[in-house]
Each structure stands twice: as structure tokens, then as C-alpha cells.
């Protein structure tokens, strides 16, 4: 299989996941869909490290692009060498899949803390509180305390499952970009393509 | 306006028991937790505990008062309930219910006086 | 338990004076995830419930005259009085909502000099 094909299916598959990343990080603002409790600053602490938006999202469209980019034939040869040019570009490729490693990283690490934090609810003395951050994630497992947080409505269940999504999701972005570190340096180094015999057009 | 009607004056005997009640008006009822607080004569605040009336009814109670008072609720009449069992002479007190909003007690009722007297 | 240790017990002051109370806990009521303190100040007049003036350590609560000022942080707090009215001769409480039990200072009684 050709190494810029393979690019371009991880480019296609970052674009999906990025948006993905955006949406899931947007939707953590708004607690059973109201504004109130973003304006009033009672949202966890990990939701305004846009981990989502910023690491898993807008900082992964770079790559994805460069990615997608890869398989296009109108990169002309450098230094007298027609392949020359498509092995910088599979190089260069594996700069922007640095970038995406710390993106998706940044994105997984924030949404484990913020998993492990639990959110910022009303607690069960009517104040808003971590109420959970003492527990050390162990709160993910007891499902029954979860009753704690009377404010806002089914908080824990909405960041649980958001803050999960996107530790999934900026797993599989990390995953894929480090297949994009280990493609861009074999189709660098062995050539643009499996066949070296393929010749391109400039 | 935000009101919380308290019950009367109480006086019992040693070893009694009490319901104090606690009506409330003027808010969403199920929008705040109320405390209850007493005062002996003379003396600073004591904090009793905590009734959110949420996810069935959430209590928090201070350890020295678990055995001693009971916190219930009519949510039909807006009502909280303190029961006080076991009563002696230390008991004797003005006992008040609050509303906390932030991370301080906004409104009080007017407080109950309990005397526990032979 | 937390202990709140309000100082002095009594003050003597007189009308249009600044007065400053203290009040002490054996442990930090600040809450390093949401950045505040958990301590709040309240008045009692004689044969009156408790009214809250300040929350949050510093926030003043809506309608108490901008006379009132809360500060501090961690384990110190300060509520100050400026141009003190008769009417706030009177006792001062604070309280810790940090760790259950929730706990009230001894009070610090103002009265005139």
C-alpha cells in the first residue's frame, strides 16, 4: 500500500475525530442543554482548558490537512530527483504528526483529570463543590454517590460521559498520529512508495 | 419575598421528644438546602446539619447531633422538619432554620425556643 | 473539627470610628480548586436571628451597606467596619463551611465606648 494513501486515510479519519472533539468539549459547557451554569462559572475547572476544542480539535486540523495533502501528485523533485520532493513532503509529515501527538495528548490528559476531579456541582450541603475530587476517580466505580451532585441535573453522568468521549477520542487521534511518525519516516526514507519502480510526472 | 416561618415555643419535660418545623415560602423550594442551626443562652452558633431536598432527600448531619436530631421534609407544603429526641437540659436552646445560597446563610427563620424543664 | 477563634471578644468604639475584628481557623478554608474561601460573617442583634453580611470570605451579600468589608485568606480573616453607625454595635460571628462539622467563631461584641 502506498504511504500517502495511508496518510491521506489518517488525515480523512483526524478531520472526522477533530470535529468530533469540538462538539463533545462545546456540549460540557452546556449542562442539560442551559447556558446558565457556563455563565455563572459553575462548570468544572478542566472544562476551560478547551482540551477539546483547542488540543483534540483545531490543533489536529493541522496535521489532518498535511496528511490529506501527501497523496496529491503535484509535488515536483528536488536536488535532480523527482522522488526527492514526495520524500521531503512524507518527512515534513511527521512534523505535523508531532503536532498532533501533543494536541491529542493535551486532550487526553485534561479529560482523565477532569474525569478524575469529577465535576462542580451543587453539593448536598448547597454549595458548589468538587465533591467528588477527594475520592481519587474512585466516585466512577460508585455510581450511588453520584446523587451528591443535586445541581445541575444528571452533572456527573453528562461529564463522565463527555469527558470519556474525549479521552477515546484523543486516544485514537494520538494512535493515529503516532501510525502517521512511523508512515512518514519509512515512506521518507524506503521512498514515496512501496514500488520504487512508480515514476511521477513534474 | 423569601420567608421561613418557624413553629412556636416549646417546653418538654426531660426525656421528651419535639418536632420543630420550618414552612417556607417565596422561592423554588427544592432550589436550596436549608440548615438548621441552634443557639444555647448566651452562647455562639451551633451547626446541626443539612437537609437538601433533592434525589429523594439528601442529609448531612453535625456527628454530635446523630442520635439527637432527625431532619424530614413535606415537599407538598414546602416544609422542613427538625425532630429532637432524648431531650435534657443542654437541648434548652433557640433553635433556627436557614437557607444557604453561595456559601453563606441568606435568610433565617425567626427561631423556636426550646425549654426542657421538669 | 475546625476551630473558628474570633479576637477580641469585646470592643469598645466609638460612633464614626474604624474597627477591625479577627478571626482565626486551625485549618486552611481556602479551596484551591474553586479559589475561595469558604468563611462567612454574619450580625446578631439581641433578640434577632443572624443576617449575613459577607460570603466567600470577601463578597459582600446584596443590601449590606459597603461599610462591611471582609478579607483575608488560608487561615486569617478580617472583618472591617468603617465609620461605625450605632447600629452596628452589636455581635459579629464568623463561619466555616470548608469541612463538616460547619463551625461558628466565639463572636466578637461591639459596644460603645
Known amino acids: 500500500m502506498c504511504y500517502g494513501k495511508c496518510a491521506r486515510c489518517i488525515g480523512h479519519s483526524l478531520v472526522g475525530l477533530a470535529l468530533l472533539c469540538i462538539i463533545a468539549n462545546i456540549l460540557l459547557y452546556f449542562p442539560n442543554g442551559e447556558t446558565k451554569y457556563a455563565s455563572e462559572n459553575h462548570l468544572s475547572r478542566f472544562v476551560w482548558f478547551f482540551s477539546g476544542i483547542v488540543g483534540g480539535g483545531l490543533l489536529m486540523l493541522l496535521p489532518a490537512f498535511v496528511f490529506i495533502g501527501l497523496e496529491q501528485d503535484d509535488c515536483c523533485g528536488c536536488c535532480g530527483h523527482e522522488n526527492c520532493g514526495k520524500r521531503c513532503a512524507m518527512l515534513s509529515s511527521v512534523l505535523a504528526a508531532l503536532i498532533g501527538i501533543a494536541g491529542s495528548g493535551y486532550c487526553v490528559i485534561v479529560a482523565a483529570l477532569g474525569l478524575a476531579e469529577g465535576p462542580l456541582c451543587l453539593d448536598s450541603f448547597g454549595q458548589w463543590n468538587y465533591t467528588f475530587a477527594s475520592t481519587e476517580g474512585q466516585y466512577l466505580l460508585d455510581t450511588s454517590t453520584w446523587s451528591q451532585c443535586t445541581e445541575p441535573k444528571h452533572i456527573v453522568e453528562w461529564n463522565v460521559s463527555l469527558f470519556s468521549i474525549l479521552l477515546a477520542l484523543g486516544g485514537i487521534e494520538f494512535i493515529l498520529c503516532l501510525i502517521q511518525v512511523i508512515n512518514g519516516v519509512l515512506g521518507g526514507i524506503c521512498g514515496f512508495c512501496c514500488s520504487r519502480q512508480q515514476q511521477y510526472d513534474c | 419575598e423569601v420567608q421561613l416561618q418557624q413553629s412556636g415555643p416549646e417546653l418538654v419535660k426531660p426525656g421528651a421528644s419535639v418536632k420543630i418545623s420550618c414552612k417556607t415560602s417565596g422561592y423554588t423550594f427544592t432550589d436550596y438546602t436549608m440548615h438548621w442551626v441552634r443557639q444555647s443562652h448566651g452562647k455562639s452558633l451551633e451547626w446541626i446539619g443539612s437537609f437538601n431536598p433533592n434525589n429523594g432527600g439528601l442529609t448531612n448531619y453535625n456527628q454530635k447531633f446523630k442520635g439527637k436530631a432527625t431532619l424530614t421534609v413535606d415537599k407538598s407544603s414546602s416544609t422542613v422538619y427538625m425532630d429532637l429526641r432524648s431531650l435534657t437540659s443542654e437541648d434548652s436552646a433557640v433553635y433556627y432554620c436557614?437557607?444557604?445560597?453561595?456559601?453563606?446563610?441568606?435568610?433565617w427563620g425567626q427561631g423556636t425556643t426550646l425549654t426542657v424543664s421538669s | 473539627d475546625i476551630v473558628m477563634s474570633q479576637s477580641p471578644s469585646s470592643l469598645a468604639v466609638s460612633a464614626g470610628e474604624k474597627v477591625t475584628m479577627s478571626c482565626k481557623s486551625s485549618q486552611s478554608l481556602l479551596n484551591s480548586r474553586t479559589r475561595k474561601n469558604y468563611l462567612a460573617w454574619y450580625q446578631q442583634k439581641p433578640g434577632q436571628s443572624p443576617k449575613l453580611l459577607i460570603y466567600?470570605?470577601?463578597t459582600r451579600e446584596s443590601g449590606v451597606p459597603d461599610r462591611f468589608t471582609g478579607s483575608g485568606s488560608g487561615t486569617d480573616f478580617t472583618l472591617t467596619i468603617s465609620n461605625v453607625q450605632a447600629e452596628d454595635l452589636t455581635v459579629y460571628y464568623c463561619k466555616q463551611s470548608y469541612n463538616p462539622p460547619w463551625t461558628f467563631g466565639g463572636g466578637t461584641k461591639l459596644e460603645i465606648k
Open positions: 436557614t437557607r444557604i445560597r453561595a456559601t453563606g446563610f441568606d435568610s
Open positions: 466567600w470570605a470577601s
